[in-house]
Amino acid sequence: AFTITVSKDLYVVEYGGNVTMECKFPVEKQLNLFALIVYWEMEDKKIIQFVNGKEDLKVQHSSYSQRAQLLKDQLFLGKAALQITDVRLQDAGVYCCLIGYGGADYKRITLKVHAPYRNISQRISVDPVTSEHELMCQAEGYPEAEVIWTSSDHRVLSGKTTITNSNREEKLFNVTSTLNINATANEIFYCTFQRSGPEENNTAELVIPERLPVPASERTHFMILGPFLLLLGVVLAVTFCLKKHGRMMDVEKCCTRDRNSKKRNDIQFEET
């Protein structure tokens, strides 16, 4: 009887990666393309329909468009190999390969997709009133993760974690965790994104810096005061110039010089 086999019935792949799932079928001598039929489906979605030596892309489900292909060269090695690129979380499920070549048979293959919380972005800010530090870690992944905060001496600290849906893909989770703590410069803290499953932890290291930039609320005060101080400086400079030289030309030179130097200071202030 015509029988197809699978070397693996479970494939685990990372979000955004590529996967090639294989079903093997018997080929004696050379493959007769016109006698071969290959179907790949996932639940009710048609992915590949290969008949008379060609794929019919008209029947392919739109979610697999430009991402799924049958590796035709592999057919001559007795393999119906489905390659999926840029794997999405929605691709997870049970796939079925059906091959007709004289006889017919089918096999099921499970695809699991995971997304590690690998790119952890971090931020450290300080409250100017209480001098308390706020440490923040944020990352996207799947499935849900809890965030564990620890200090360099391995103390577990209690942070606050919020989970929302990602803007990138609906099934992806956006996990943000904050830790408020009194800390000193060069002290080290760790945020660990812990998912269910073995070896699924991702950790970021946060080092308290020597000096921290002024929080946004403080910068607002400077933005309000800035123009006033600038104006005051210009008035004082003009008065000084007029008193010292008593000539309009000197006033213009002095003001220009002062205004330019002020501009440079503003730029430097904005950059820091």
Epitope: N52, G53, K54, L57, K58, D73, Q74, F76, L77
Partner: antibody
């Protein structure tokens, strides 16, 4: 740009073997099929077979099975065709031709094989 | 194997006028996916063949739009709207539906 550079002309004795090469450049060698085509003097084109460098998979026209053997060297982006048990009928120009699954688009300049005692 | 048939010679044409070259296949090259797997190649004297048309009606890169192709599943025609001196050579049709790939015998374009 895509280029297929074939080896020079060959003059060989009947019963001998010959290996013709086709060096590819300007594209990813392992992503396309390399076809071989025979053209006898003053005659049409005859497809010998192809090899897919990525996997080494081959397909031969039944008429050339046992006569032609297709191989590749991925490290040098070169495809080879070994022709064995040569007779005067094998005297021809042999072309390599790059293709995807459906379309052959770039040809080598051809290698002239003369079988004569 | 799919057999491709062509006339050895075309009707002689005058430069600047149109020319037609025919090709027939022993089985339909129209696939259920709606694509017809026929290619046209031109081999100029002393040169390698070059691709003109693929999938029956698609013009290959760099080929002037004077060339066009049409047909049913088994009968095909290559048209050259304004023949130029550089168009002389042998025109081959080829099927890429089945394996082995097969070529027609070639049609020589003759100029009056």
């Amino acid at each position: 740009q895509v280029q297929l550079q074939q080896s020079g002309p060959e003059l060989v004795k009947p019963g001998a073997s010959v290996k013709i090469s086709c060096k590819a450049s300007g594209y990813t060698f392992t992503d396309y099929y390399m076809n071989w085509v025979k053209q006898r003097p003053g005659q049409g084109l005859e497809w010998i077979g192809w090899i897919f460098p990525g996997s080494g998979a081959t397909y031969y026209n039944e008429r050339f099975m046992g006569k032609a053997t297709l191989t590749v060297d991925k490290s040098s982006n070169t495809a080879y065709m070994l022709f064995s048990s040569l007779t005067s009928e094998d005297s021809a120009v042999y072309f390599c031709l790059r293709s995807d699954w459906d379309v052959g688009d770039f040809w080598g300049q051809g290698t002239t094989l003369t079988v004569s005692s | 194997d799919i057999v491709m048939t062509q006339a050895a010679f075309s009707n002689p044409v005058t430069l600047g006028t149109s020319a037609s070259i025919s090709c027939r296949s022993s089985r339909s090259l129209l696939h259920t996916n709606g694509i017809t797997y026929l290619s046209w190649f031109l081999q100029k004297p002393g040169q390698s063949p070059q691709l003109l048309i693929y999938q029956m009606s698609n013009l290959a890169s760099g080929v002037p739009d004077r060339f066009s192709s049409s047909g049913s599943g088994t009968d095909f025609t290559l048209r050259i709207s304004r023949v130029e001196a550089e168009d002389v050579g042998i025109y081959y049709c080829a099927q890429t539906l089945g394996l082995p790939r097969t070529f027609g015998g070639g049609t020589k374009l003759e100029i009056k």
